[in-house]
Amino acid sequence: EDSNCGENEYHNQTTGLCQQCPPCRPGEEPYMSCGYGTKDDDYGCVPCPAEKFSKGGYQICRRHKDCEGFFRATVLTPGDMENDAECGPCLPGYYMLENRPRNIYGMVCYSCLLAPPNTKECVG
């Protein structure tokens, strides 16, 4: 009876129809399983753990961008349970390569040790 329910649907035994799994609020993630016709009895939403965020719906919580450690950039806006961190300009001693295609992480800062001569962020 439930084989045709979608990714985020369970089979509601009261109506005989597929029904949307209850979506989570921003800052929460699903706990246990719901979808493709079944819903765990304990299915619900739980707050994101520290250093993670979620936009809600059926998203799991994801780790905030590590601006300083990975991107070697300053923190423009720290992340919270609902929003990712936003990175600002490069840390001292690092520069951003212009005209370089964005990778999946956005722009990454590179060490001034590898910079071409007269790179403005690395002069002085």
Epitope: E1, D2, S3, N4, C5, H11, Q13, T14, T15, G16, L17, C18, Q19, Q20
Partner: antibody, heavy 121, light 112 residues
Framework: EVQLQQSGPELVKPGASVKMSCKAS????????MHWVKQSHGKSLEWIGY????????SKNQKFKGKATLTVDKSSTTAYIQLNSLTSEDSAVYYC??????????????WGAGTTVTVSS | DVVMTQTPLSLPVSLGDQASISCRSS???????????LHWYLQQPGQSPKLLIY???NRFSGVPDRFSGSGSGTDFTLKISRVEAEDLGVYFC?????????FGAGTKLELK
């Protein structure tokens, strides 16, 4: 008296979209799911999907997932269906139907008069 | 999806005759809750469908007792004991046990 009043006939061009309405009266709008059913010319009935007016949650037949968008306006007790990227295959009569469920009964107990959609250039 | 097969597709009758329409499903319509969600709808000319029989054999409110439904599992029958003029139209069987709900192709009850 429970009634579902549907909007008038539509003549639309291929590739365009169309939005039809179904105004409910005579009952608690948020207490029943509203379903949409397609009847192609001289053919049988096909279930498109439903919307729960209480919370706007929808579920659709896989066949119509990219074709139909279901919405409601609780303040006017009106359900809507929008069909996009229309082709001649979408020419049909579209019915809204109230879905009764309770005591493990479930069925379409009230139907609108239908909206005829003709897709033609 | 569950396929609903109706026979015959056309049924010529005279007023006062008995009429019988068959409906067969491609899989059992017995729900895990024990109910069988096989319904019959009538679409009179130029009108929208109306519910006649729900859950195999239960007449919907206002439906005359000349209409009766029977069957189980995958085989179902709608009978009209004495056909009246207002009974003419297209009869659809429909299942609501499995998702999505599906309908038969319809049986047109018409005068000989």
């Amino acid at each position: 008296e429970v009634q579902l009043q549907q909007s008038g006939p539509e003549l639309v061009k291929p590739g365009a979209s169309v939005k039809m309405s179904c105004k409910a009266s005579g009952y608690s709008f948020t207490g029943y799911n509203m379903h949409w059913v397609k009847q192609s010319h001289g053919k049988s009935l096909e279930w498109i999907g439903y919307i729960d007016p209480y919370n706007g949650a929808t579920s659709k037949n896989q066949k119509f997932k990219g074709k139909a968008t279901l919405t409601v306006d609780k303040s006017s007790t009106t359900a809507y269906i929008q069909l996009n990227s229309l082709t001649s295959e979408d020419s049909a009569v579209y019915y809204c139907a109230r879905y009764y469920y309770g005591d493990y009964h479930w069925y379409f107990d009230v139907w609108g008069a239908g909206t005829t959609v003709t897709v033609s250039s | 999806d569950v396929v609903m097969t109706q026979t015959p597709l056309s049924l010529p009758v005279s007023l006062g005759d008995q009429a019988s329409i068959s409906c067969r499903s491609s899989q059992s319509l017995v729900h895990s809750n024990g109910n069988t969600y096989l319904h019959w709808y009538l679409q009179q000319p130029g009108q929208s469908p109306k519910l006649l029989i729900y859950k195999v054999s239960n007449r919907f409110s206002g439906v005359p007792d000349r209409f009766s439904g029977s069957g189980s599992g995958t085989d179902f029958t709608l009978k009209i004991s004495r056909v009246e003029a207002e009974d003419l139209g297209v009869y659809f069987c429909s299942q609501h046990t499995h998702v999505p709900p599906t309908f038969g192709a319809g049986t047109k009850l018409e005068l000989k």
